[in-house]
Structure formats: C-alpha cells, structure tokens
Interface confidence: low
Amino acid sequence: SSSPTSSASSFSSSAPFLASAVSAQPPLPDQCPALCECSEAARTVKCVNRNLTEVPTDLPAYVRNLFLTGNQLAVLPAGAFARRPPLAELAALNLSGSRLDEVRAGAFEHLPSLRQLDLSHNPLADLSPFAFSGSNASVSAPSPLVELILNHIVPPEDERQNRSFEGMVVAALLAGRALQGLRRLELASNHFLYLPRDVLAQLPSLRHLDLSNNSLVSLTYVSFRNLTHLESLHLEDNALKVLHNGTLAELQGLPHIRVFLDNNPWVCDCHMADMVTWLKETEVVQGKDRLTCAYPEKMRNRVLLELNSADLDCDPILPPSLQTS
C-alpha cells in the first residue's frame, strides 16, 4: 500500500479518534495493557469502565476472555483485533456499553476461536454488512461465532440513517452465509417493527433466539420451519396481536421448542380462536396461563386459556349505507 511521505507514527494528537500506529512486535507473554487487569491463570483480560478510545494493541497472546465494557471506543475498524501473532485463543469478547456507533467490515477478522461476541448497549448507527463475515464474497469462510448478543444496539432516533435498522442488522447476520453455525442470537430491545422474512431460514443452527422487548406486530411472514434445533424463542414484550394458523403449526412442529409470549397486547376477537384452541392443547408455550387479552376493551385482562369460541366475536362490518358518521 502507498502512503504519504510521513510515517503513521507522526499522526497529530489533535485528532483524538485517530488510531495510533502500532508495532508488529508480539507482546511479551506476561504483559498486561495499561488500564487493564489480567489473569493468565484465568486467561482473562478486563479493561472495564476505563474510557478507552481504542482497543489496546498489546493484549497478551494467552487471552481467552476479553472484557472491554464501559469504554468509549466509538469505532471498531477493520481488523481491530488483528495481531502478530494472532489472538488465537480469544473465545469470548464483550464490548457492551462502549459507545460504539460504527462497526466496520472485517472488525473481527483474525480471531479464529471467537465463539461469543457481545455488542449490546452500543448505539450502532452503522453496522457494516461485512462486520461478522469480514468479506463481501457471496459465500464467506464460516465464522466461528456460536453466540451473538446484540441487545439494545438501536441508536437514538435522531442518529438513525435513512434506512431500515432491521435491514441493516439482518444484512450483517446474513452476509456471506458466514453465521451458519450460530446457536444463540439475542436481539432484544431494538425497536424492531418486523423480522425480515429470510433471516431465520439462513440461520439453521439456532438453538436460542431472543426477540423480546421489540415492537413486533405480526409473525405472518416469518418462517420457523427450518429451525429444527430451536429450543427457546423469546417474544415477550412485543406488540403481537395474534398468532395465525401457519405460525402455530410451524411452532408445534419444532421438536425441542419453548416459546415465551408474555406481555403482548393480544386482541381477543374472532381471529384469536385458533390461537386459543392451540394454547389449550400445546405444551410449548411457557407460562401460557399468564397470557391475557388487551383488546377489545370488554375483554381486557381476560385469560386466554379461559376463553371459548362464544367469547371471541368480531363486530359485524356494516355496509356503507348503514354506517353512522
């Protein structure tokens, strides 16, 4: 690569978000970065609540568990954890609450053992489609990730770009089919209004999916059919009104599934009849006796399991000539 006449080490300190140049020399085995705590016995490095603005360059090669929480990282550039020699043992990386607003393509490249990644509580206005795949190839090398925790990564309304936040996250999950081995995906508290229909079909290894505390209104176009390993599906605290027959049949067909549906505004009218019948028979819904109606007003707080078909009526739709203004 070409570069300007001055070496990178002469970068001006007047730009605080500029990554400093780093030697390619491997760190000493017992070295611990400034502002961090290290335990070689536990293979753990903790750099917590230290207002770090970049990932320490001198991480010890033995690190297996790395906590970089409560910092001010702002940006994770490509190869943010690339080292010579590589951090070959790093398996769990927690970056939660570190004010990240941008994760660039290839940010987690050169981490061959990375199994668990937590980016929760960062306002990710710009999550590259290739953040996890590291490549824009249609099929990338498989990521080693097994758990991806992305709870509360939605940025404030005024920092969102003119594009779907759901779409941005899903693009990163699906790029290059790199996350085919993902077993746990947490996407709670992200204001999701919908779930793009293709996302679950392309994550066939999922065991645990957490979509709680979002704003999902419907699952009509979401297919669970391919998720034969799914063990838990968290849909609490959404805006679900009813689950329709197709969804009910798909959930019932999953051999190991437990579904959590508390605190949704169920609409108990004639469209709810199939769901009520299913709830009475199924064992897959945890705490099903706690599910209550939110609408219509006359049904509020009624327990779904206690309803019968006579309770579930729809007001007739009057022809225009009979409607009152």
Epitope: S1, S2, S3, A8, A19, A21, V22, S23, A24, T57, V75, P77, A78, G79, A80, A82, R84, D101, E102, R104, A105, G106, E109, A125, D126, S128, P129, F130, N136, E159, R160, Q161, N162, R163
Partner: nanobody, 120 residues
Framework: EVQLVESGGGLVQPGGSLRLSCAAS????????MSWYRQAPGKGLELVAS????????RYADSVKGRFTISRDNAKNTLYLQMNSLRAEDTAVYYC?????????????WGQGTLVTVSS
C-alpha cells in the same frame, strides 16, 4: 489493485472555498469508512474528517468543524471534502484514505494527494 485519485486542489484566497474529490477503485467502496488527512509543510499527518460506510456518521478535527463537510456518493465510488471559509493554516497536501484493514498490517491505502494553498 486499490486506487485512490484525489482532485480539486489549487490556490484559493482566505475565506474562499474548494471541493476535493477522491475517486476510488479496486475495492467495494460502499463497504468501508473513508477519511481525509492533510499534511502541512514540515508538519505531521493530521486526520481532517472521516465518514462511515453509508454516510450516516461523520467526524471532524476540531480545527475544521463548521467549515469542512465530508460526504460520499457510493454509486459513484467517490469521496468529497467541501472546504469553506478557508484559512492560511489549511494550506497542506490533502490525502484520501481507505482503511481496508488494520493500519499496522499495512492494509490502509492512500491517494497521491492534492495540494491546497490558501494565500492572498
């Protein structure tokens, strides 16, 4: 082969404006954050401004805030720097930068630079 070609530099009077462009090729432009740096005579390299992949987030050095605006057109594979209210201290060679990987592994790429001279 990655190529970055800057244009738009020149001589301008204090208080004037210029618009720099950087045409990129050889990589998926829309997938990478881009930056403008500058190097004044006898000085070190200074980061002027950077922009995220979709252009939704920008950052500026304090010395140019409110005067310079970085933008990008992913359809045209082009990065821009609009420079207003130029001052003598803005005189420098301006470089376009694409950080495609960690700088320490030599995976950042630079244009050849374009000279901006602010003088009356």
């Amino acid at each position: 082969e990655v190529q970055l070609v800057e244009s738009g530099g020149g001589l301008v009077q204090p208080g004037g404006s210029l618009r720099l462009s950087c045409a990129a090729s050889g990589f998926t432009f829309s997938s990478y954050a881009m930056s403008w740096y500058r190097q004044a005579p006898g000085k070190g390299l200074e980061l002027v401004a950077s922009i995220t992949t979709a252009g939704g987030s920008t950052r500026y050095a304090d010395s140019v805030k409110g005067r310079f605006t970085i933008s990008r057109d992913n359809a045209k594979n082009t990065l821009y720097l609009q420079m207003n209210s130029l001052r003598a201290e803005d005189t420098a060679v301006y470089y376009c930068n694409a950080e495609l990987g960690p700088r320490r592994l030599g995976m950042d790429y630079w244009g050849q630079g374009t000279l901006v001279t602010v003088s009356s």
